[in-house]
Interface confidence: medium
């Protein structure tokens, strides 16, 4: 239904305390330098002007579409060229072409120093003196590093690091009780980052098509009770709030988001026996609960696919008749009975069905031709499989450090030209997989891996689309999402790349790594294993691990030592002369 | 180069006939599946029947069936779509197209105005 004024539509929908999350996080996120201060003024501004709207609905710039009223809000902030360069270009621009230019303008990558948190008796004086400012701060902070953060789950995360500080606040070891559990909020919302920016990846390089097929299969592995008619019902709305989001329509998706957590809630029997628990939460833990709620128990008499899509003599006939619909039935009826796949690897398996049934019933005898395509799958559900078994087996030997560092040797191998920070964070995300995938259950491993790892390439894929420099992750890069993860898997030593010479500085180090935390430590080490790969990308594994060992001998003895700055000035060189030995 | 070159287009009354001939020339004609797909004033392109390559399986969207037929002469390389029956809600640039219902080359179109 149309209303008056838009802005007290949500604002009356959503309630003052989640308008002006949402609001917050959708400035940050345009205007990702501007301090906390500069934001919080603007969504006082706007929170205020939605309270005379909602007084009035009748009152002057009410009826403005929020578009125009966030981006004439953007557009007013004094020295928006000074700060932001060409982004203030886009204020010349009219609604919806402003509102499309700030998107173009989000970075993905901005030049933010890392978020760091505070001591545990600082964060709690502040959290206790004002805690609407301090999970402001939060908001913001979150925001403007992971510019297409989903809003409302970026609101379910502050109520969460909400209620830890309320806590353990309260008890007297502050520090212990906060820092576990704050740790396992960030790596929740993290991975909760990566596969947002997965999707609004999807929904802007292949549209909503694409996305929708990715939210069929997805939910039908989830719901494998509910009808086609009720996946596709819950898809389309799925579809609607993800692009709201990724389009920076915050308040609509939050809204959207609510509605259809009420909708799943009030239509449980037709869609699923395990979702009374998520129902039982207030909204915000609701939505979150639903998101990644358990799979329901499949239905036991489920008949054998190839009845309807390869035994059926119509199947032509009806594939020619209701393309999308007879594809997606069949991507819905194979997702129902495979929650052990990954979305990427049922997505792939409806594309290479596609391809047959476009093939086969173009020829004289198509039974015949389309007869073996399930057996044609096969290959396709192999190398997942053997990918997952592989490198499981891996960091069960290895271990997290030791697997991320065999990652970043594999990966500086197929793509040297890519600078050393981003092949470090890349290869660390993509090892954290073991520690979050490889100890689940047997049928769980390969969705969590594949799902995962195809969200971190599609960062790194972003990462390079703003400086190209390897030519094997752009083509891995162009093609479509779920061939991404399989094409970086089957990249091998970058045979045209020219060694880099070896600088003695890159592998110098001062005592100041002694006191780092472990974390940075680590990344110190990975920075200098990636170099040497790039020094020498086709070092066996032996040569490598000798030198590293080495390394870690070298700073264990020097970190040991009495004089540290004369251990590190004088076993340094020697180090660098074995090393270069050792590759020789 | 694939080319497809559509003709037949034109004003007809409500209940009248035309008969569209597509061309086709830069690619192996009787390996292919053809179709038409056609495109309302104002609106997206809606699928309208699909011919398999050697001319044996013929499919129809239900608001052309028994009225529209499709058929070809792989001798000739031509499709050609048959349209009786016509009505007003027919109106739209027609386009012959190579492919069975995942179209990879498309002609320019034909336009074909029922109108009384």
């Known amino acids: 239904e149309a209303h008056k004024s838009e802005i007290a539509h949500r604002y009356n929908d959503l309630g003052e305390q989640h308008f002006k999350g949402l609001v917050l996080i959708a400035f940050s996120q345009y205007l990702q330098k501007c301090s906390y201060d500069e934001h919080a003024k603007l969504v006082q501004e706007v929170t205020d002007f939605a309270k005379t709207c909602v007084a009035d609905e009748s009152a002057a710039n009410c009826d403005k579409s929020l578009h125009t009223l966030f981006g004439d809000k953007l557009c007013a902030i004094p020295n928006l060229r000074e700060n932001y360069g060409e982004l203030a270009d886009c204020c010349t621009k009219q609604e919806p072409e402003r509102n499309e230019c700030f998107l173009q303008h989000k970075d993905d990558n901005p030049s933010l120093p890392p978020f760091e948190r505070p001591e545990a008796e600082a964060m709690c004086t502040s959290f206790k003196e004002n805690p609407t400012t301090f999970m402001g701060h939060y908001l913001h902070e979150v925001a403007r590093r992971h510019p297409y953060f989903y809003a409302p789950e970026l609101l379910y995360y502050a109520e969460q690091y909400n209620e830890i500080l309320t806590q353990c606040c309260a008890e007297a070891d502050k520090e212990s009780c906060l820092t576990p559990k704050l740790d396992g909020v960030k790596e929740k919302a993290l991975v909760s980052s990566v596969r947002q920016r997965m999707k609004c990846s999807s929904m802007q390089k292949f549209g909503e098509r694409a996305f929708k097929a990715w939210a069929v299969a997805r939910l039908s592995q989830t719901f494998p009770n509910a009808d086609f008619a009720e996946i596709t019902k819950l898809a389309t709305d799925l579809t609607k709030v993800n692009k709201e989001c990724c389009h920076g329509d915050l308040l609509e998706c939050a809204d959207d988001r609510a509605e259809l957590a009420k909708y799943m809630c009030e239509n449980q029997a037709t869609i699923s026996s395990k979702l009374q628990t998520c129902c039982d939460k207030p909204l915000l833990k609701k939505a979150h609960c639903l998101s990644e709620v358990e799979h329901d128990t499949m239905p036991a008499d489920l008949p054998a696919i190839a009845a309807d899509f390869v035994e059926d003599q119509e199947v032509c006939k009806n594939y020619a008749e209701a393309k999308d619909v007879f594809l997606g039935t069949f991507l819905y009826e194979y997702s129902r009975r495979h929650p052990d796949y990954s979305v990427s690897l049922l997505l792939r398996l409806a594309k290479k069905y596609e391809a047959t049934l476009e093939k086969c019933c173009a020829e004289a005898n198509p039974p015949a031709c389309y007869g073996t395509v399930l057996a044609e799958f096969q290959p396709l559900v192999e190398e997942p499989k053997n990918l997952v078994k592989t490198n499981c087996d891996l960091y069960e030997k290895l271990g997290e450090y030791g697997f991320q560092n065999a990652i970043l040797v594999r990966y500086t191998q197929k793509a040297p030209q890519v600078s050393t920070p981003t092949l470090v964070e890349a290869a660390r995300n993509l090892g954290r997989v073991g520690t979050k995938c490889c100890t689940l259950p047997e049928d769980q491993r390969l969705p969590c891996v594949e799902d995962y790892l195809s969200a971190i390439l599609n960062r790194v894929c972003l990462l390079h689309e703003k400086t190209p420099v390897s030519e094997h992750v752009t083509k891995c890069c162009s093609g479509s999402l779920v061939e991404r993860r399989p094409c970086f898997s089957a990249l091998t030593v970058d045979e045209t790349y020219v060694p880099k010479e070896f600088k003695a500085e890159t592998f110098t180090f001062h005592s100041d790594i002694c006191t780092l935390p472990e974390k940075e430590k680590q990344i110190k080490k990975q920075t200098a294993l990636a170099e040497l790969v790039k020094h020498k990308p086709k070092a066996t594994a032996e040569q490598l691990k000798t030198v590293m060992d080495d390394f870690a001998q070298f700073l264990d003895t020097c970190c040991k030592a009495a004089d540290k700055d004369t251990c590190f000035s004088t076993e340094g060189p020697n180090l660098v002369t074995r090393c270069k030995d050792a590759l020789a | 180069e694939v080319q497809l070159l559509e003709s037949g287009g034109g004003l007809v009354q409500p209940g009248g006939s035309l008969r569209l001939s597509c061309a086709a020339s830069?690619?192996?004609?009787?390996?292919?599946?053809m179709g038409w797909v056609r495109q309302a004033p104002g609106k997206g392109l809606e699928w309208v029947s699909t011919?398999?390559?050697?001319?044996?399986?013929?499919y129809y969207a239900d608001s052309v069936k028994g009225r529209f037929t499709i058929s070809r002469d792989n001798s000739k390389d031509t499709l050609y779509l048959q349209m009786n029956s016509l009505r007003a809600e027919d109106t739209a640039v027609y386009y012959c197209?190579?492919?069975?219902?995942?179209?990879?080359?498309w002609g320019q179109g034909t336009l074909v105005t029922v109108s009384s």
């Open positions: 197209a190579k492919g069975f219902r995942r179209f990879d080359y």
């Open positions: 830069g690619f192996t004609f009787d390996n292919n599946a």
């Open positions: 011919i398999s390559a050697n001319g044996n399986a013929t």
